[in-house]
Interface confidence: medium
């Protein structure tokens, strides 16, 4: 599925995104634009053997388990393949479980990239939340 | 136990298109990726490319671009590969296995020939 | 691409003697390298996963060995049902890649 970007920012809030860990919703939403596209089935490959998953590219090697990625850690305890479900559920516990872990939203290279210190409210700009 | 069943041998014309098919039994279809190989006499095997059929998520090898379509039809836990104008150089035998990074399942083959 | 290249392309051996094949990849793999047995007409079958870990069911005589770029499968006391083509590949990146095999027959 490829959410708009208000009805992301409602489904995300409804998840207990908003102001998770200090993130407001505008970040999240940020991220999932710069990481995904808002496509809940994006999967990018990376060097290391590992692939990215989901709205919010979670990664295989740490948090996620597609049986092939060497080292797997599986912090979030689940498939790979329930990150590409349209229903956001299992993206956002596991996101929920990395931005708790030390480094916050820095987790996500697109977030730190491209919303890191921007306007992200603009995110939510016009939104019925 | 995991098997993966393949479609039987085909005999085509070169230009014509087939259809291969793996069916996964034994595990969660939709978990796992789906690899499929290519096998010619002389020339050892070559991966062809891979697709999650929860998503249908898909890469390809460079070289099948074009070549090979993958799909996979999830209530039937079947995967399908479609190879098109074909021609000689395609004849060969193709498998499908799971995608573990290794290949410990595979299907039995399917054995393709393009003659005229 | 990485390019696994597997030497020797043919060795001829009596039942009994011990064995090593090589492979070796065109750059660092880690261990991400993998050993299979095809005997004619049959899938390829998975013997050693993880350069080093023996698959389930494999018997003790097939053991692997290496890192980064050389890598070595070795077979103990050589049984006749071993002999066949053996193949390694890698899933460090993709696409993924098959050495182009070597065939192991009786002498």
């Known amino acids: 599925k490829v959410f708009g970007r208000c009805e992301l920012a409602a489904a995300m809030k409804r998840h207990g995104l908003d102001n998770y860990r200090g993130y407001s919703l505008g970040n999240w939403v940020c991220a999932a634009k710069f990481e995904s596209n808002f496509n809940t089935q994006a999967t990018n490959r990376n060097t290391d053997g590992s692939t990215d998953y989901g709205i919010l590219q979670i990664n295989s090697r740490w948090w996620c388990n597609d049986g092939r990625t060497p080292g797997s850690r599986n912090l979030c305890n689940i498939p790979c393949s329930a990150l590409l479900s349209s229903d956001i559920t299992a993206s956002v516990n596991c996101a929920k479980k990395i931005v708790s872990d030390g480094n916050g939203m820095n987790a996500w290279v697109a977030w730190r990239n491209r919303c890191k210190g921007t306007d992200v409210q603009a995110w939510i700009r016009g939104c019925r939340l | 136990q995991v098997q993966l069943q393949e479609s039987g041998a085909e005999v085509m014309k070169p230009g014509a298109s087939v259809k291969i098919s793996c069916k996964a039994t034994?595990?969660?279809?939709?978990?796992?990726?789906i690899e499929w190989v290519k096998q010619r006499p002389g020339h050892g095997l070559e991966w062809i490319g891979e697709?999650?059929?929860?998503?249908?998520?898909?890469y390809y090898n460079e070289k099948f671009k074009g070549k090979a379509t993958f799909t996979a039809d999830t209530s039937s836990n079947t995967a399908y590969m479609q190879l098109s104008s074909l021609t000689s150089e395609d004849s060969a035998v193709y498998y499908c296995?799971?995608?573990?990074?290794?290949?410990?399942?595979w299907g039995q083959g399917t054995t393709l020939t393009v003659s005229s | 691409d990485i390019e696994l290249t597997q030497s020797p392309a043919t060795l001829s051996v009596t039942p009994g003697d011990s064995v090593s094949l090589s492979c070796r990849a065109s750059?660092?793999?880690?261990?991400?390298l993998h050993w299979y047995q095809q005997k004619p007409h049959e899938s390829p079958r998975l013997l050693i996963k993880?350069?080093?870990q023996r698959a389930s069911g494999i018997p003790s005589r097939f053991s692997g060995s290496g890192s980064g770029t050389d890598f070595t499968l070795s077979i103990n006391s050589v049984e006749t049902e071993d002999f066949g083509m053996y193949f390694c590949?890698?899933?460090?990146?993709?696409?993924?890649?098959f050495g182009g095999g070597t065939k192991l027959e009786i002498k």
């Open positions: 296995a799971r995608g573990d990074g290794w290949y410990c399942y």
């Open positions: 034994g595990y969660t279809f939709t978990t796992y990726w």
């Open positions: 697709i999650l059929p929860g998503s249908g998520s898909t």
């Open positions: 750059q660092s793999i880690s261990n991400n």
């Open positions: 993880y350069a080093s």
């Open positions: 590949q890698q899933s460090n990146s993709w696409p993924r890649t």
